[in-house]
């Protein structure tokens, strides 16, 4: 039972992860205009991976699209390529968990093929969530860096009667939910990780072994023992459910005392 | 089609204070008050983001003048408190747009500081 | 708080003439997100409220006959009227639309020669 808690949550939290790391990617608040000294600004800036936003005081709002590939500096470019392979790894993680998950009936899948399967999009969540981090990092050492930069730009050349405000950008919101969703994908391949564990059937076979008792020759043979850690489900009182389809959702609603196979 | 109608000004003694209302129609993300002097140019006065009620005025109205807006009535308001001679203007409501700019104002409203 | 300065203060023209009307900010209206200049031109004549022509430096509003024109970056701005017509004799306004307080120019008064 536990193993199979273990895993749902698991696929659940990568779930929720990977939404949050899409939503992040998509998200056009990576940089966000600072407001020192000013929280009330008649333009905000604001900065994604795919467009550069500006809204008024009006109300207005327009956004840009970078158009160039080749233009756009190699950070941003990698930050981009980072987030795209999280969430492909990802998507392929969740798709192969969906089949390993211990609740879900897939013709006469062995233990052994869903342990395998767990551990695979496992893995994979982990790569998916430290990708994402990974991104979300670099880009925020970069606007670190250019915050920096512009600070000292902005108490510079100064010298003429004509002052030119430099924009600093700031952490925006894309970055903190990368950050997090990150987090919850590579916690929720760990959880699969520790479920592929537990389903995993240790096959440990026992040789005969010979008692010679004296006058008698009584050999005790017994069978190949499954090791059980607890978790995994006994093949001799296997309870197959075939009395209809239960949706995942049913089975986190409705918590049975046997373990679903 | 937006439209911008002020209401409420008149004459004040010195340290009086005076409610300025201007009804509106029509889509208005944000507004702004500003000022004439007779003779004068214009002066801004202060700006509300109509749906969040977030203010902001220009240095020599902080304090004394308070911009607000009544969503059920549609009506954005100037509360203008210890009135001097030189606040004596015609006040007019805009409304901001694109870029920033002021596309629709209403006709004005004379307010006089004297004693 | 950013400083409008508008030269001339008044100018005397005839119908036809082209006018040119320059407004100087005491800090860049240009923004780095857009590379927009966010400085807005108004119109007003005697007893009527102000008119909204040019916003974002060069943007017609609607509805403003094609003999305005608006341009400049940064700190230096033109405001243009290529044939000035009778009903254009009024006082202009430039406004700076980049940052709270908002500021208008003095005001640059059109009569008539």
């Known amino acids: 039972m536990a193993v199979t808690a273990c895993q749902g949550l698991g696929f659940v939290v990568s779930l929720i992860g990977i939404a949050g790391i899409i939503a992040a990617t998509c998200m056009d608040q990576w940089s966000t205009q600072d407001l020192y000294n000013n929280p009330v600004t008649a333009v905000f800036n604001y900065q994604g991976l795919w467009r550069s936003c500006v809204r008024e005081s009006s109300g207005f709002t327009e956004c840009r699209g970078y158009f160039t590939l080749l233009g756009l500096p190699a950070m941003l470019q990698a930050v981009r390529a980072l987030m795209i392979v999280g969430i492909v790894l990802g998507a392929i993680g969740l798709l192969v968990s969906i089949f390993a998950l211990k609740c879900i009936r897939i013709g006469s899948m062995e233990d052994s093929a869903k342990a395998n399967m767990t551990l695979t999009s496992g893995i994979m969540f982990i790569v998916s969530g430290l990708c994402a981090i990974a991104g979300v990092s670099v880009f925020a050492n970069m606007l670190v860096t250019n915050f920096w930069m512009s600070t000292a730009n902005m108490y510079t050349g100064m010298g003429g009667m004509v002052q030119t405000v430099q924009t600093r950008y700031t952490f925006g919101a894309a970055l903190f939910v990368g950050w997090v969703a990150g987090g919850l994908t590579l916690i929720g391949g760990v959880m699969m990780c520790i479920a592929c564990r537990g389903l995993a059937p240790e096959e440990t076979n026992y040789k005969a072994v010979s008692y010679h008792a004296s006058g008698h020759s009584v050999a005790y043979k017994p069978g190949g023992f499954k090791a059980s850690t607890g978790f995994g489900s006994n093949t001799k009182n296997k309870k197959i459910y075939d009395g209809g389809a239960r949706t995942e959702d049913e089975v986190q609603s409705y918590p049975s005392k046997h373990d679903y196979v | 089609e937006v439209q911008l109608v002020e209401s409420g000004g008149g004459l004040v003694q010195p340290g009086g204070s005076l409610r300025l209302s201007c009804a509106v129609s029509?889509?208005?993300?944000?507004m702004n008050w500003v000022r004439q002097a007779p003779g004068k140019g214009l002066e801004w006065v202060a700006w509300i983001n109509m749906y969040t009620g977030e203010p902001t005025y220009a240095d020599d109205f902080k304090g004394r003048f308070t911009i607000s807006r009544d969503d059920s009535k549609n009506t954005l308001y100037l509360q203008m408190n210890s009135l001097r001679a030189e606040d004596t203007a015609v006040y007019y409501c805009?409304?901001?747009?694109?870029?920033?700019?002021?596309?629709?104002w209403g006709q004005g409203t004379l307010v006089t500081v004297s004693s | 708080d950013i400083q409008m300065t508008q030269s001339p203060s008044s100018l005397s023209a005839s119908v036809g003439d082209r006018v040119t009307i320059t407004c100087k900010s005491s800090q860049s209206l240009l923004n780095s997100g857009n590379q927009k200049s966010y400085l807005t031109w108004y119109q007003q004549k005697p007893g009527k409220a102000p008119k909204l022509l040019i916003y974002w430096a060069s943007t017609l509003e609607s509805g403003v006959p094609s003999r305005f024109s608006g341009s400049g970056s940064g700190t230096d701005y033109t405001l243009t009227i290529s044939s000035l017509q009778p009903e254009d004799f009024a006082t202009y306004y430039c406004q700076n639309a980049y940052s709270f307080p908002f500021t208008f120019g003095q005001g640059t008064k059109v009569e008539i020669k």
């Open positions: 805009a409304r901001l747009s694109k870029g920033n700019g002021m596309d629709y």
């Open positions: 029509g889509y208005t993300f944000s």
